[in-house]
Interface confidence: low
Amino acid sequence: HSDGIFTDSYSRYRKQMAVKKYLAAVLGKRYKQRVKNK
């Protein structure tokens, strides 16, 4: 069901954002720089 797929996808997106914020806060500029250089 497309709505279910979309909902699940967005839920994962929310979680990814939370993880990204956590990593940015904990690792700071080093994390951002590493991502940039990949």
Epitope: F6, T7, Y10, S11, R14, K15, M17, A18, K20, K21, A24, K32
Partner: antibody, heavy 117, light 110 residues
Framework: QSVEESGGRLVTPGTPLTLTCTVS????????MCWVRQAPGKGLEWVGF?????SAYYASWAKGRFTFSKTSTTVDLKIASPTTEDTATYFC??????????????WGPGTLVTVSS | DIVLTQTPASVSAAVGGTVSISCQSS????????LSWFQQKPGQPPKLLIY???TLASGVPSRFEGSGSGTQFTLTISDVQCDDAATYYC??????????FGGGTEVVVK
């Protein structure tokens, strides 16, 4: 940390208009930014947001009428073809979320757009 | 379309009294708690009071309390002060990547 909108002015219907939100003290690579508008004497209306990865999401009524874009320190809202119904104060706000909450925690003072012939 | 119904539209309160504002959603907000409350005074931007349905924003007096989950939420202002005269809005954040404001409640302090 601050947010400030600019670019609001009197325009005639159909004249494209771009509003700019300038942020300082935090990074747009970490935070999402949201646009909210308020017609004179009316309630708040959510327009949409642009996320930290540059993807834009719009309210169902706003799709096709507004476009968001951003640089490292600014977020733009473009009204392609304004109508008199777009007359409002436009607010830019930092849209922060975690898995456990969502919040619009930092607002600009707003910029007034008047659409009139 | 999702509807977020705020009641009452206007309420009068005496200084020292208590005010309750209800916010009912036609669908559950994201995570059952992605609901915020804002205070707005004329000529000013909205000010965040409560987020996550019940978490007090920084610098907001503990007289403000948020409760509820899913589709039904309440903002309670205890020991009402003159400075609390304002319009209050709830904001729901939904799985469909849409945020909806309630219609607002004007609080008049006598």
């Amino acid at each position: 940390q601050s947010v400030e909108e600019s670019g609001g002015r009197l325009v005639t219907p159909g004249t494209p208009l771009t509003l700019t939100c300038t942020v300082s003290g935090f990074s747009l690579s970490t935070y999402n930014m949201c646009w909210v508008r308020q017609a004179p004497g009316k309630g708040l209306e959510w327009v949409g947001f642009i996320n930290s990865d540059d993807s834009a999401y719009y309210a169902s009524w706003a799709k096709g009428r507004f476009t968001f874009s951003k640089t490292s320190t600014t977020v733009d809202l473009k009204i392609a073809s304004p109508t008199t119904e777009d007359t409002a104060t436009y607010f830019c706000a930092r849209y922060d979320w975690d898995y456990y909450y969502s919040r619009l925690d930092l607002w600009g003072p707003g910029t007034l757009v008047t659409v009139s012939s | 379309d999702i509807v977020l119904t705020q009641t009452p539209a206007s309420v009068s309160a005496a200084v020292g009294g208590t005010v309750s504002i209800s916010c009912q959603s036609s669908e559950s907000v994201y995570n059952n708690n992605y609901l915020s409350w804002f205070q707005q005074k004329p000529g000013q931007p909205p000010k965040l009071l409560i987020y996550g349905a019940s978490t007090l924003a920084s610098g907001v007096p503990s007289r403000f309390e948020g409760s509820g989950s899913g589709t039904q939420f309440t903002l309670t202002i205890s020991d009402v002060q003159c400075d609390d005269a304002a319009t209050y809005y709830c904001l729901g954040d939904y799985i469909i990547i849409e945020n909806i404001f309630g219609g607002g409640t004007e609080v008049v302090v006598k």
